[in-house]
Each structure stands twice: as C-alpha cells, then as structure tokens.
C-alpha cells in the first residue's frame, strides 16, 4: 500500500497507514486509508480492495502457469497540496520468489520518465516468500509545474508492469493570467481595466485598488473588469486576487492623463543651401499620446515688417525636415511645434538660419565670337550679367565650345576668372562649325548658359579675311 505524507515525516514506516508490508498475499492489493493530512486524497475508487482486472506478466517458460500475476499495490490516487509545500508518495509491489528477473522501479510523469533532478529512493524488504519493493518519491517545495499524473514502471521477467496513477494537484495563491495594463486616457473619459487570476483553488475574488485605496467594497469573481468613469490626474491602479490560499497583488499600473505635448527642443540646422535649409529637432514629451505631425514655422529675419510666416507640415518622425523654396543669401527665423490627439505644443525657441548665396540667375549678354585666323584662335567677348546680391559674388565664367565637322564632334569647356569680359581659345578643327555658350559662376554655383553663338571655321589658308561670328538660328544678338 502507500500514501502521501507531509515532508516533515521522514521515517520510512510513516509512509504507510499500517505497518510495513512484509509478505503480502499474492494478488491482494490492500487499500491504505489516507492520513488525516488535508493535503492528501484517496484513490478514485474508495474502498476497492483490488481491481477487476490486473495486468499479469507474460512469462514464456513452461512453468508460466505456476507464476502468480504481479501488479503494483494500490496506492493513494489523488494528492492536493499547496504550492511550496513538500510532498512524498510511493509505489509498492510484492515479487514472489518464483520471478527470477526484476529491474529497478522508474517514476514517470505525464508519460515521460523522471530522471536526475528528482528525489527517489527504492527500498527492498525480502522474506522467505519473495521481496516487497517500495519506491519513494519526494518533491521539495512543489511548484505548479509539478502538477501531473505520476506512476511507476518496473520490468518483471521482461514484462513491463505499470502502477495506477497518482494525480498530484498543486494549489497555490492566485496566479495572474491577465493583469491591468498602463493606459493613457483623455481627461474625464471613461476607460476599462481588466484583471484575471486563477487557482487552483477556485474561486478567485478580485478587489481593485486605486492610489492605495480599495475601489470596490465587495469582491468580484475573476475575471473582473473595472470601469473608471474618468480621471483628472494620474492615478495608480492594481488588483488584489484572493482565494482560499491567500492573496496575490498585481503590478501597479499608472494611468496617465493625455495632455498637449511639450515644445520640441534642440532645433538645429544640419545643412543650408541657397534655397533650402535642413532642420532637425528633439521632440518634447509627447503628453502620453503619440505625436501625429509637426509644423515648421519660417519667417524672414531681415524684414522690418512683421513678415508673413511660412508653415511647413511634416510627419512626426523622423525629426528632420528640409525647408525648400527659400531665397538665396537670406536670414530666416525657424521654430517647430508638434501635435498629438489633444492639440499642438507651444513652439520651440526660434533659431536663426541663413541660406547660402545662389548661382547667377541670368547668362552673360552680348556674346560675340571672332576668328583670328592668323593666330588660329577664337576671340570671344561678352558683357557681365546683372548679378543680384543673393546670387553671390562673381568668381568667373564657364565657356562651352562645341566643334562639329563631317564625322567629328568635340565638346570642350574652359573656366576663366571674372577679370575682364573676353577670352581666347585655340581653333580645334577647320572646315567646321563652332558653337559657343557662356555661363557666369559665383560661389553659389553656375548660372544659366547664354544662347548659343555659331561661327564657321573655313579650311586652313583658304580665306584671306577674318570672318566674324553669326548668331545661331533664333539668336537676335548683334554680332
């Protein structure tokens, strides 16, 4: 027989409801009544002295008919105990001397053999008729994961004998499967919190706590939903789960009231060009509501009048925006504001930023091209374009000259300094057409090219006068 014990009872004979079995009658499986410990339960078939059927070992020897059937003695069927308690239970079997081969008893839980980390002891009690074997199993400080169906296995004459199961049901303090979660809510707007805890043992009752004070006087059965009609300031909520074993308290969760965001900070200029400024910022506190978009406000700093503010909207992320369509070489004041579902933040502190000088907006004028055949050069002249302040300081010109003749095409360019308004370039090909275009250059870049001017380059030494340039078709500039 066998039963389960509290841990403190360590003597072997205390594992049984009666004295240790010496030689039990063959095929008799006594039921041992459980001890009075409240953490033990009897088998499902209370009062049964032996099963209707037992699995008798198969023996292949000629004496098999003489071998009585062997089975594990009936043991306790169900143990209910509290988490962190200690438990012992056992299997026992009587093997008559007629059985020659027996292997050790192994313990199994939910179909898997228990190896290593578990504490089991097997004791043998021989007498003149055979041997009684008792396998003791103990678990120190049981956890919920120790829940399960335990049974013993043993090989006798190469036949596997399996005990009836011992169901171990671990009860403990309530265990949360759903705890309240932090939420951010609109001021004075109702919201729900959910708390669910389970045993065993059931039932589990829930009390809600707000800022250390109980919300509900009467407990609610788990799961519980708390409807809060609305808050005006941040609060901390938790739930208490109670069962017969005691109390478990959930984590405390902050319920925050959504407000407008704080203004962005650290507005920086990452890059400037003549017509754009790349600005970055660090978002302010989001006011417990995700930032939806941001607004970049731009005004000209130089204007005496309260110049109109340009507003550029962008997504809240990334915290970066390229302001475009600005004037070159101009000063701007820039600030950023962001919004969440509640509203717009105040604007960040204003910062100053400048665009760089631009490229010229007009091409050089009055371009003329003369062929100096004796020196085999082109003489090119132009007048300086009217460059605005924001176009920057003139640093030079780029002259593009393209040479075309039958089967030959050559595209070249020269850069000349701003001193003077003329240049000379060597003739590249005779019996060809040369097309010349000129653009002004400032630190802000290269401006537009002039309309093309064409000049025909005759064959070498066939002409005794110096031809002048002819405007390209559609060009009305004088030669």
């Amino acid at each position: 027989g066998g039963t389960a014990e509290k841990w403190e009872e360590t003597e072997l004979d205390q594992l049984f409801s009666g004295p240790l079995p010496g030689r039990l009658p063959v095929n008799h499986r006594p039921f041992s009544a459980p001890h009075s410990s409240r953490d033990q339960l009897p088998p499902p078939q209370t009062g049964r002295s032996h099963p209707a059927h037992t699995a008798a070992p198969q023996v292949t020897s000629t004496a098999s008919k003489l071998l009585p059937p062997v089975a594990f003695n009936h043991t306790i069927g169900h143990i209910v105990l509290s988490e962190h308690k200690n438990v012992k239970f056992n299997c026992s079997i009587n093997i008559p001397n007629t059985y020659q081969e027996t292997a050790g008893i192994s313990w199994w839980k939910d179909g898997k053999e228990l190896l290593g980390a578990h504490h089991s002891i097997t004791q043998f009690y021989p007498d003149e008729e055979g041997v009684s074997i008792i396998a003791l199993f103990s678990i120190a400080s049981v956890q919920r994961s120790d829940n399960g169906s335990y049974f013993c296995k043993m090989k006798v004459n190469n036949r596997e004998i399996v005990s009836d199961p011992i169901y171990v049901e671990v009860q403990g303090l309530p265990y949360f499967i759903k705890q309240p979660e932090s939420v951010n809510v609109t001021r004075n707007t109702a919201f729900n919190l959910t708390c669910q805890a389970v045993g065993p043992p059931e039932p589990v009752n829930i009390f809600w706590v707000q800022n250390s004070s109980r919300v509900n006087e009467k407990p609610e059965r788990s799961p519980s939903v708390l409807t809060v009609p609305g808050l005006t300031e941040t609060a901390v909520f938790s739930c208490e789960a109670h069962n017969d074993k005691g109390l478990t308290v959930s984590k405390g969760v902050h319920i925050n009231i959504k407000v407008i965001p704080s203004p962005p900070t650290e507005v920086h200029i990452l890059n400037s060009t003549a017509h754009s400024i790349l600005v970055s910022w660090v978002p302010g506190f989001d006011g417990y509501s995700p930032l939806q978009n941001c607004s970049i406000q731009v005004k000209e700093a130089d204007r005496l009048s309260n110049g109109s503010v340009m507003v550029f909207n962008t997504s809240a992320s990334p915290h970066l925006y390229e302001i475009q369509q600005l004037q070159a070489l101009a000063n701007y004041s820039i600030a950023v504001s962001c919004r969440n579902e509640i509203g717009w933040s105040a604007v960040s502190p204003w910062i100053l930023a400048s665009t760089t000088e631009g490229a010229p907006s007009v091409a050089p004028l009055n371009i003329t091209v003369f062929l100096n055949e004796s020196n085999n050069i082109l003489d090119i002249r132009w007048t300086k374009p009217p460059i605005k302040r924001q176009d920057g300081e003139l640093v030079g010109y780029r002259i593009s000259h393209v040479w075309e003749s039958a089967g030959t095409y050559k595209e070249l360019s020269e850069e000349v300094s701003q001193n003077g308004s003329w240049a000379q370039i060597p003739v590249q090909i005779h019996n060809a057409t040369c097309t010349v275009r000129i653009a002004a250059i400032t630190k802000g870049g290269i401006g537009p090219f002039s309309e093309p001017v064409n000049i025909i380059i005759p064959e070498h030494s066939k002409v005794d006068y110096a031809p002048s340039s002819t405007p390209a078709p559609g060009n009305t500039d004088s030669m």
Epitope: P34, P44, T46, F72, H78, S149
Partner: antibody, heavy 118, light 112 residues
C-alpha cells in the same frame, strides 16, 4: 488542447456486439483514466466504468459487468468499449471522458449513438 | 451506491434571474482528508456534458463567474446569478467519492 474524438453512430441488431472507439489527443494518453458514461434518450447519465491506459487496469459499475468491456491501444491513443448481447435497453448515446488532475471528468467526447433494432 | 437526488427536475426562469439547483446525496461525499468530490455539469441540447464546477465550489477554466457552487457533506447547491440564453440546458451533479460514480437525475433550465 485536450480532445476526445469518438467513432460514428452504430445501428446494430439485437444479440450482436458493437465496439466503439475514443481517440485521445492533446495530452499523455497513458497517464490519465478514461471513463465511459451511458445516456439513454431523454434520461440521465449512467457511469459504466474506467480504464487506465498505462496499465489497462479497469473498474466497472456492477450494472455493466458482462455487458461492457473496456480496452485501450496505447500506440494509437485510443480507448475502446465493446458492448455485447445487445438489447433495445442498450440503445443510447455513449460518452468517453477523461478523469483530469482535478479528479473530475474534465473533457468529454462528442458521444456515439448506438441503436439496437431488428 | 450513493444515490444523488437533484431538485427541481425543471426550472423555468426569466433571463437575468438567479437560478438555484440542489443536489442531495444518500451518503456523505466528504473524504477523510476533507475534500469532497462533487462536480456540476451542463449539457446543452445536442452536446456533450461540460464541466462547470469541480469539488463543490471550484469553477473550471473558462467558466463564467455567474456560476458558483456551495455545500458540504450531503447537500450541495449550484447557483447561476444572472441567467443568460446560453445557460439553457440540463444540469447534472456527479459524485466520484464512492464507486460506482453516480449522477443526479438532471435539472432542465428553461425560459419561462
């Protein structure tokens, strides 16, 4: 998840036998008792008995000894109940159910209808 | 055998009402260790029985908190605090303290 899938309805003649099955899944079949329950049309429930598949031990309600035979095939995780010498009194829906750790019949099969008619 | 007497046989209720079902055993269902193996089941039309309450007062997983069980020894009660349409069916008690296990005769919960 734990499931018990029973075989389909049976129409059998008086005096014959029928064997109905209950295939378990979602848990260790050899570790938990399987119980069988009878329900006659419009009537209550009658407990037939149990089998522990791990060792094939059985326990019967005296009322059903000689009528029902419980077996189990661990290789297919299937429990069987054979009903013999059938009469119209045996016409019923038969359920298999698992005895869970909480020592209650926690999961049930969908039932097998047996009709005994000549 | 432990005879389980269940009352009433039929229980007409209005939705939202409380319902109470009694189950009485011919012998005590309390074990020597203090546990009592009395369980409650609901069988909806055309379905298998489903476990509601185990060992007198423990709600099985997934069972609504409208269901509660109480009692000891030989007298047990199942209460449904606010009956909903999905609660309709036949309620059984089952004892597994003594062999053979025995069921109550059933209580049919129906709409008035």
């Amino acid at each position: 998840q734990v499931q018990l899938q029973q075989s389909g309805p049976e129409l059998v003649k008086p005096g014959t036998s029928v064997k109905i099955s209950c295939k378990a899944s979602g848990y260790s079949f050899t570790s938990y008792y399987i119980h069988w329950v009878k329900q006659r049309p419009g009537q209550g429930l009658d407990w037939i008995g149990w089998i522990f598949p791990g060792n094939r031990n059985t326990q019967y309600n005296e009322k059903f000894k000689g009528k029902a035979t419980l077996t189990a095939d661990t290789s297919s995780s299937t429990a069987y109940m054979q009903l013999s010498s059938l009469t119209s009194e045996d016409s019923a829906v038969y359920y298999c159910a698992r005895l869970g750790l909480i020592y209650a019949l926690d999961y049930w099969g969908q039932g097998t209808s047996v009709t005994v008619s000549s | 055998d432990a005879v389980m007497t269940q009352t009433p046989l039929s229980l007409p209720v209005s939705l939202g009402d409380q319902a109470s079902i009694s189950c009485r055993s011919s012998q005590s269902l309390e074990n020597s260790n203090g546990h009592t193996y009395l369980h409650w089941y609901l069988q909806k039309p055309g379905q298998s029985p489903q476990l509601l309450i185990y060992r007198v007062s423990n709600r099985f997983s997934g069972v609504q908190d409208r269901f509660s069980g109480s009692g000891s020894g030989t007298d047990f009660t199942l209460k449904i605090s606010r009956v909903e349409a999905e609660d309709l069916g036949v309620y059984f008690c089952l004892q597994v303290t003594h062999v053979p296990f025995t069921f109550g005769s059933g209580t049919k919960l129906e709409i008035k």
